[in-house]
């Protein structure tokens, strides 16, 4: 159930409506809960979660990552630069979230919910952003060929890719959440 639609909200119509910031915060935490469920299934199925960063680094996925220059960390914090990075990063993650579909057995609905909730989050954030021109949208053709390439990997690499996407997306969202709470 997406944020704002749970039974508690229905049962409390007198409650103050959520502000834009609260809605974004709640949306990110909802997606993080979804990622947690997916990671649980992945980690129960394989030992990928115990892999060290060094082993993971061998996989050459170009997943979005926060860096100091993006203005989202405590040092060098820059609201506008950071917001652009968050939106751009989420847009870049969309192809990887598409890859995750059909990668789960017992959590298939959860994978779909993470994907759909991310689309909603992007919309929320785009409303908040002043400098939409600075946001680059990934090229659909490049995304399509990347998806084909990922799906053609062997089973072990597909498991590793799934684990890496979930871990990186969780990390990216948590960095985003911390930064958005400063705005």
């Amino acid at each position: 159930v997406p944020p704002g639609e749970d039974s508690k909200d229905v049962a409390a119509p007198h409650r103050q409506p959520l502000t834009s910031s609260e809605r974004i915060d709640k949306q990110i935490r909802y997606i993080l809960d979804g990622i947690s469920a997916l990671r649980k299934e992945t980690c129960n199925k394989s030992n990928m979660c115990e892999s060290s960063k060094e082993a993971l680094a061998e996989n050459n996925l170009n997943l979005p990552k926060m860096a100091e220059k993006d203005g989202c960390f405590q040092s060098g914090f820059n609201e506008e630069t950071c917001l652009v990075k968050i939106i751009t990063g989420l847009l870049e993650f969309e192809v990887y979230l598409e890859y995750l579909q059909n990668r789960f057995e017992s959590s298939e609905e959860q994978a779909r919910a993470v994907q759909m909730s991310t689309k909603v989050l992007i919309q929320f954030l785009q409303k908040k952003a002043k400098n939409l021109d600075a946001i680059t949208t990934p090229d659909p053709t490049t995304n399509a060929s990347l998806l084909t390439k990922l799906q053609a990997q062997n089973q072990w690499l597909q498991d590793m890719t799934t684990h890496l996407i979930l871990r990186s997306f969780k990390e990216f969202l948590q960095s985003s959440l911390r930064a958005l709470r400063q705005m």
């Epitope: 609260e22 915060d25 935490r29 993080l32 809960d33 947690s36 990671r39 649980k40 980690c43 979660c49 115990e50 060290s52 960063k53 990552k65 926060m66 860096a67 100091e68 989202c72 960390f73 405590q74 040092s75 871990r167 990186s168 990390e171 990216f172 948590q174 960095s175 911390r178 709470r181 400063q182």
Partner: antibody
């Protein structure tokens, strides 16, 4: 079982430096946020600094910003706190803590604490 | 920065009593609040995270409630081993901040 063992504390003069280490075992270190918390003699707990899993994102209390640097070596399962320009008010027991998290929980909270290492800044 | 105001600083009580400690945040912190217990000469211990979630192994007489700016830790039926200092911590946004602490002691 989870273990956090701090070392590197001691007596240092004002303006001096110390490097604290925290050796972690019993869990996949790289999956967790780690935090330093300190407690001055007879006083309450004070959050000092946190470092996140893979992003390199760090955060500091205003009282130590620009003087302390938190870092981690995931290959060595070790957390560090480099403390420069030490002041007498930095005198405290420094605890290394593990943040709830890893695979499931996203909420803040420190579920494991080391025994602490004493740092005394005095001339 | 978000300030945390914990009260009371000292709480004289009797065994078997119900004890309530409050923590007030200077702005909304959602449910990003945890509670810790520290006994003299010991390291702190996590009791509650996410404002109301009981940490594994913590007795059920401990409970947490609240959201936004106002939070409460309740000990229902104080036992001798509960005599300690309790701290709240906001983990919503940096710099994270502990409350000043509440010492629960016998009258």
């Amino acid at each position: 079982q989870v273990q956090l063992v701090e070392s590197g504390g001691g007596l240092v003069q004002p303006g001096g430096s110390l490097r604290l280490s925290c050796a972690a075992s019993g869990f996949t270190f790289s999956n967790y946020y780690m935090t330093w918390v300190r407690q001055a003699p007879g006083k309450g707990l004070e959050w000092v600094s946190s470092i996140y899993s893979f992003s390199g994102d760090t955060a500091y209390a205003d009282s130590v910003k620009g003087r302390f640097t938190i870092s981690r070596d995931n290959a060595k399962n070790t957390l560090y706190l480099q403390m420069n320009s030490l002041k007498s008010e930095d005198t405290a027991v420094y605890y290394c803590t593990r943040n709830l998290g890893g695979v499931v929980v996203t909420t803040n909270g420190y579920d494991y604490w080391g025994q602490g290492t004493q740092v005394t800044v005095s001339s | 920065d978000i300030q945390m105001t914990q009260s009371p600083s000292s709480l004289p009580t009797s065994l078997g009593d119900s004890v309530t400690i409050t923590c007030q945040a200077s702005q909304s912190i959602s449910d990003e609040l945890s509670w810790y217990q520290q006994k003299p000469g010991q390291t702190p211990k996590l009791l509650i995270y996410g404002a109301s979630k009981l940490q594994t192994g913590v007795p059920s007489r401990f409970s947490g409630s609240g959201s936004g700016t106002s939070f409460t830790l309740t000990i229902s039926g104080l036992e001798a081993e509960d005599l300690a200092t309790y701290y709240c911590l906001q983990g919503y946004s940096w710099p994270f901040m502990f409350g000043q602490g509440t010492k629960v002691e016998l009258k």
